[in-house]
Amino acid sequence: KKVVLGKKGDTVELTCNASQKKNTQFHWKNSNQIKILGIQGLFLTKGPSKLSDRADSRKSLWDQGCFSMIIKNLKIEDSDTYICEVENKKEEVELLVFGLTANSDTHLLEGQSLTLTLESPPGSSPSVKCRSPGGKNIQGGRTISVPQLERQDSGTWTCTVSQDQKTVEFKIDIVVLAFQKASSTVYKKEGEQVEFSFPLAFTLEKLTGSGELWWQAERASSSKSWITFDLKNKEVSVKRVTQDPKLQMGKKLPLHLTLPQALPQYAGSGNLTLALEAKTGKLHQEVNLVVMRATQFQENLTCEVWGPTSPKLTLSLKLENKGATVSKQAKAVWVLNPEAGMWQCLLSDSGQVLLESNIKVVPTW
């Protein structure tokens, strides 16, 4: 007998063909031998089976000898052997209906686990293979688990259910709730305005929650809360902000914070957390601020950086259009009795300049 796989909620068409291409008597029955549908004259008639309301046939194909049965809004319990009786012959079709659903909400926080559960008819032994948007392959039986969701797991998961050499494909949209970046570093010269942006990696119709930015200044012994805010339908409202520094926050998404000026005492790292309504857990983004200052004091030209820098970063002092350079993998460099001219202080990573500050040294007569 023919095996057909169907998806819960979908429509399936079970075919039944007569040898003669003409309209003739036919019946579809379930395994209990109860009539589902049939033909009476030129009319489609329905029996009292549970499928009566969801079963139909393509009347336009009857005169071609095609007596298919269409079942709408498939349910797992529709899995059965269906019998088509036409021209004194019986054709049996086994329908197996599967459902694949995410155990929880399909909007999950980064780091949370995703479980996909397969609903299947009794007696079936299907196998499931799922492919993430990032190309990760996961196999399983009745359940498939992804222990720690990552940003790149956001998107459409394609799962293939196999049974009796037949396959049916499910597509499940998963949204990983996270910021676009796990961490970002802003490099600024002393006195410059600092812009922190926290774009989300997802969009939601209604986005409501609350957040806070905690800051650990390099010079401070403990961290402190710089700002707390509410998010209501994508509108941002500040609840509380420190007096120093006096941060400003944008009213619309993406979350945007402005620090009026970069000062060494602000250099450090912060953690922005966002708790979304009806979600357990929080979204996190780390943000770092590196501040550079170049000064000349008496016969000493100094360049310093504050904030979280990697040991492989190079700090250099260089006289414009001259070869004279002092360079160190350190947080401060200096030149004694510098030549007159425009000096550049550069913070670079493998030759790529991250931050630069110019200071003019005037000749001393």
Epitope: H27, N32, Q33, I34, K35, K46, G47, P48, D53
Partner: antibody, heavy 120, light 107 residues
């Protein structure tokens, strides 16, 4: 074993809505179709329609425009509403379970029936 | 809708008699036919399903035959408790329809 009990007002005014409830005891209301059948005094049986928790109801076309059926799984009850009643709707109303198994389809369990009179 | 016509509409018989009731469908209903018994003031009771199968707990003196459009219901030897009204019911096509009934009285 499963038992059915109809309840509702015995007297309904013409043009009003007849409302009846059938309570299922001794078994679950899920998985089965539940029917309403009526019988005017001294006459035959007329199938009004049927309902199931997981499917749309099926109504007798002769009454379809006036009939509404619903199920309340939490109370293990199903109900019938028949609008714009006339004296012709005076009858004994029965609720019954429709059972399907191999080569079998029948109303195997019935309520004892409730008499509804339409009169002003 | 499928019309179900029963013959006779009423009949008188004595205890021990063999009684046959017929039911005719307005179109082919295969063997999708049930027979019910209803006693005064009581709900109907299913006796025969699928035209010829005896419901469990129903005495074997009751039997049914037929297929297509013509069906018969027989009581081989009438017992005092058998006097009632009998209905045929088709379940080939929705709406489910009943015959008008046959009243069996004591002669």
């Amino acid at each position: 074993q499963v038992q059915l009990q109809e309840s509702g007002p015995g007297l309904v005014k013409p043009s009003e809505t007849l409302s009846l409830t059938c309570t299922v005891s001794g078994g679950s209301i899920s998985r089965y179709y539940w029917s309403w059948i009526r019988q005017p005094a001294g006459k035959g049986l007329e199938w009004i329609g049927r309902i199931c928790t997981s499917e749309n109801p099926n109504y007798n076309p002769a009454l379809k425009s006036r009939v509404t059926m619903s199920v309340d799984t939490s109370k293990n009850q199903f109900s019938l509403k028949l609008s714009s009643v006339t004296a012709a709707d005076t009858a004994v109303y029965y609720c019954a379970r429709e059972l399907e198994r191999l080569n079998y389809y029948g109303m195997d369990v019935w309520g004892q029936g409730t008499t509804v009179t339409v009169s002003s | 809708d499928i019309q179900m016509t029963q013959f006779p509409s009423s009949l008188s018989a004595s205890v021990g008699d063999r009684v046959t009731i017929t039911c005719q469908a307005s179109q082919d209903i295969s063997n999708y036919l049930n027979w019910y018994q209803q006693k005064p003031g009581k709900a109907p009771k299913l006796l025969i399903y699928d035209a010829s199968n005896l419901e469990s707990g129903v005495p074997s003196r009751f039997s049914g035959r037929g297929s297509g459009t013509d069906f018969t219901f027989t009581i081989s030897s009438l017992q005092p408790e058998d006097f009632a009204t009998f209905y045929c019911q088709q379940y080939d096509t929705l709406p489910i329809t009943f015959g008008q009934g046959t009243r069996l009285e004591i002669k």
